[in-house]
């Protein structure tokens, strides 16, 4: 594949990497494959700089990022270990809240209205965020 | 609610060419990639072509390549397939979907002399 | 291309019996697998996505399950209107393929 030097259109870059903000919800499943499909994936925030960058363009509103903990342990979806990795949960999060009435717990992170993380079921059709690296050799095929 | 039609299908010649059309209401259709899917009679289901949400990225069923076009106008919320060299083969009904939630009714394409 | 199987290809059964469909890939496909309803001239309508998610306004007695390269999807307690025929899709990569689809009638 080709390597990527600048971002798609409708992307934002910063540094070094690609972002999408979506304008509608999705559940966290179907934002995932969007992302994957783009040759891209969630949002995965390693920095205190990043994680502002994100809220400012996110703004005050629920938001997937690419963290999940569905098969056990919390884990990104780019392999960025998570033990440790820039964290900026709500206080008492996550908590794989049972309460919902939804069946389950709570397995998908997102940005709360103050861009701080909390842990929520997946099926809730939130707004996200996909993200793809400069400079990483780029999947698609020549277009037809 | 979200809503997909199609229109454009109908009886064309072997060799002939068809643009197919999907309106698309009811979503913010510029976060949703777009696919079409063909059915042909008493058969399966077959992926025809995807488009990003941008309409930057493109892909093809193998058989479909060169003949197929795919294209969007986000400003219109509307997606296309453009049919040429047609073949008896591609006689079926033609879907529209969105991501792979959403699907229309779809088209009935005929292709025969 | 990942070849998407299915079985059975058609099952007969009554109002209340659990039914049980799967669906297998020529190779692994993480949870990126759907199922969806099709009645005869309708649009299809999806049941379950990622596997195991149940999509919203879909009645709780269906279910999916499984992960890589073999899935399930299971009907607890068949209703009238759940008379149809079901197929998965796999979307982890292109081309985007379907299994050939199970149709359930009345016994």
């Known amino acids: 594949g080709s390597e990527r030097t600048c971002c798609p259109v409708n992307w934002v870059e910063h540094e070094r990497s690609c972002y999408w903000f979506s304008r509608s919800g999705k559940a966290w499943a179907d934002a995932d494959n969007y992302c994957r499909l783009e040759d891209a994936h969630l949002v995965v925030v390693t920095s205190w700089e990043e994680q502002k960058f994100v809220q400012h363009h996110i703004g005050p509103v629920n938001t997937w990022m690419g963290l999940h903990d569905q098969n056990g342990p919390w884990k990104w979806v780019d392999g960025t270990d998570y033990e440790t990795g820039f964290k900026n949960w709500r206080p008492e999060q996550p908590d794989d809240w049972y309460g919902h009435g939804l069946g389950g717990g709570e397995d998908c992170a997102h940005f709360t209205d103050d861009g701080r993380w909390n842990d929520d079921v997946c099926q809730r059709p939130y707004r996200w965020v996909c993200e793809t690296e400069l400079d990483k050799a780029s999947q698609e095929p020549p277009l037809l | 609610q979200v809503q997909l039609v199609e229109s454009g299908g109908g009886l064309v010649k072997p060799g002939g060419s068809l643009r197919l059309s999907c309106a698309a209401s009811?979503?913010?259709?510029?976060?949703?990639?777009m696919i079409w899917i063909r059915q042909a009679p008493g058969k399966g289901l077959e992926w025809v072509s995807y488009?990003?949400?941008?309409?930057?990225?493109?892909y093809y069923a193998d058989s479909m390549k060169g003949r197929f076009t795919i294209s969007r106008d986000n400003a219109k919320n509307s997606l296309y397939l453009q049919m040429n060299s047609l073949r008896a083969e591609d006689t079926a009904v033609y879907y529209c979907?969105?991501?792979?939630?959403?699907w229309g009714q779809g088209t009935l394409v005929t292709v025969s002399s | 291309d990942i070849q998407m199987t299915q079985s059975p290809s058609s099952l007969s059964a009554s109002v209340g019996d659990r039914v049980t469909i799967t669906c297998r890939a020529s190779?692994?496909?993480?949870?990126?697998l759907g199922w969806y309803q099709q009645k005869p001239g309708k649009a299809p309508k999806r049941l379950i996505y990622?596997?195991?998610n149940l999509q919203s306004g879909v009645p709780s007695r269906f279910s999916g399950s499984g992960s890589g390269t073999e899935f399930t999807l299971t009907v607890s307690s068949l209703q009238p209107e759940d008379f149809a025929t079901y197929f998965c899709?796999?979307?982890?990569?292109?081309?985007?393929?379907f299994g050939p689809g199970t149709k359930v009638d009345i016994k």
């Open positions: 488009i990003s949400s941008s309409g930057i990225t493109k």
């Open positions: 009811g979503f913010t259709f510029s976060d949703y990639y």
């Open positions: 190779q692994g496909i993480r949870n990126d």
């Open positions: 979907a969105a991501d792979t939630i959403y």
């Open positions: 990622g596997a195991s």
């Open positions: 899709l796999q979307h982890t990569s292109f081309p985007f393929t």
